[in-house]
């Protein structure tokens, strides 16, 4: 309740997160023209990426373009990219939708289609749908530990969400354990009324709100966080212009003294931790 006699000030906060969990991924792997099932293990270093500010990212799905080399090749025949003669291809032109710089030549992409030759990382990335179901759908069972230190400088008061009495094996539950700062990712989605399995395919942005409503008067002292969760991106993926959340990164290596890379389009959940609240004292 609002105590008008108190002097209130906004919270100053710092956040640190640690994600834990292992995922086993089964996917089709093509080697020498033969497609077979490949199994791989993903640990924290494989699926999380350091982000700036109060955010962390968990990869839930991906599309790979393996063995790319910097050379000349036909660009991917996306809509409007096909050609029938060199006239359609402009030397030095960099189409924002393309993956390279045009050489001015129209060349065969496959048996039936021709596209402009580009100087690029080849073969150029194909426009593939994100795998369904998501490859790392088991990320639902990953957990994140959120460490949140807060400070009210005007009241010279500092505290944090993790208490010395806390059990390291607890899991947050709105009713049974509302002060546990270890969250199961699937539970975060459930609390927000979202389907993890569905969001994991294209990715998304989830908000973890930490609300501190602190009464710092000694006779009725209370300063503990309240956690709530809500989805922050546009959930109507069919209608939104660029659905979900994804980015590309590359792993570089040398093969027979030739620099190559594997391009990975990573889909996943960016978790934004939003800390707000006030501290009041007479």
């Amino acid at each position: 309740s609002d105590k008008l006699y108190q002097r209130k000030e906004p919270v100053i906060s710092s956040v640190h997160t640690k994600v834990k969990g292992i995922a086993e991924v089964t996917e089709n792997v093509t080697e020498g023209g033969v497609t077979k099932l490949g199994h791989s293990i993903f640990d924290t270093a494989d699926y999380t990426f350091p982000l700036q500010g109060n955010s962390f990212f968990v990869m839930t799905n991906y599309v790979k373009s393996e063995g790319q080399v910097q050379t000349l090749c036909p660009e991917y025949p996306r809509r409007g990219a096909q050609c029938s003669s060199d006239r359609r291809c402009k030397k030095g032109w960099m189409d924002p939708q393309s993956k390279g710089i045009q050489t001015g030549r129209c060349v065969p992409y496959d048996k039936t289609r021709k596209t402009c030759e580009v100087s690029a990382w080849c073969p150029t990335e194909e426009e593939k749908e994100a795998p369904r179901p998501a490859l790392l759908r088991s990320a639902e069972n990953f957990t994140v530990l959120i460490k949140n230190n807060i400070h009210f400088p005007g009241h010279n008061y500092t505290t944090r969400n993790i208490l010395p009495t806390m059990n390291g094996s607890c899991t947050f539950h709105k009713t049974w354990d509302p002060q546990c700062s270890i969250f199961r990712l699937g539970d975060i989605f459930q609390e927000a009324g979202e389907n993890f399995t569905e969001v994991a395919v294209q990715g998304g942005i989830m908000g973890i709100e930490i609300y501190w409503d602190c009464n710092l008067d000694s006779w009725s002292h209370h300063c503990r966080p309240r956690y709530s969760f809500r989805r922050l991106d546009d959930k109507n993926t069919d209608e939104s212009f660029v659905p979900g959340y994804n980015f590309r990164y590359a792993k570089y290596y040398k093969e027979n003294n030739v620099e190559k890379r594997t391009l990975i389009k990573a889909f996943g959940i960016r978790f934004d931790i939003l800390v707000f609240g006030t501290g009041g004292k007479f």
Partner: nanobody, 120 residues
């Protein structure tokens, strides 16, 4: 139908020369690679040519001995093999692919191959 047909193979003495041809029909190609496979060994990429600019690639073991050229009008590429060694003995085939340039065989053309035997 997309087809590639090799010719020019045969028996030659060590130090001798051969010229292999790879003729394409039913498609216009962009990159052609020459491959070889010796008995009990893996298929090895020997040379590639890019039709648009005529640039070529040769694997280290044949550099300075093998050259590749093209005749666009005839839809044919050639592999000139000089200073042949017994270890060059293999079945030589051409295909619309080049691993070195990360160009997969989307066109799907691959010849049956021609035998090259180098005697010592």
């Amino acid at each position: 139908e997309v087809q590639l047909v090799e010719s020019g193979g045969g028996l030659v003495q060590s130090g001798g020369s051969l010229r292999l041809s790879c003729a394409g029909s039913g498609f216009s190609y962009y990159i052609i690679g020459w491959f070889r496979q010796a008995p009990g060994k893996e298929r090895e990429e020997v040379s590639c040519i890019r039709v648009t600019d005529g640039s070529t690639y040769h694997t280290n073991s044949v550099k300075g001995r093998f050259t590749m050229s093209r005749d666009n009008a005839e839809n044919t590429v050639y592999l000139q093999m000089n200073s042949l060694k017994p270890e060059d003995t293999a079945v030589y085939s051409c295909a619309t692919e080049c691993q070195r340039w990360a160009y997969p065989n989307r066109i799907g053309a691959r010849g049956q191959g021609t035998q090259v035997t180098v005697s010592s």
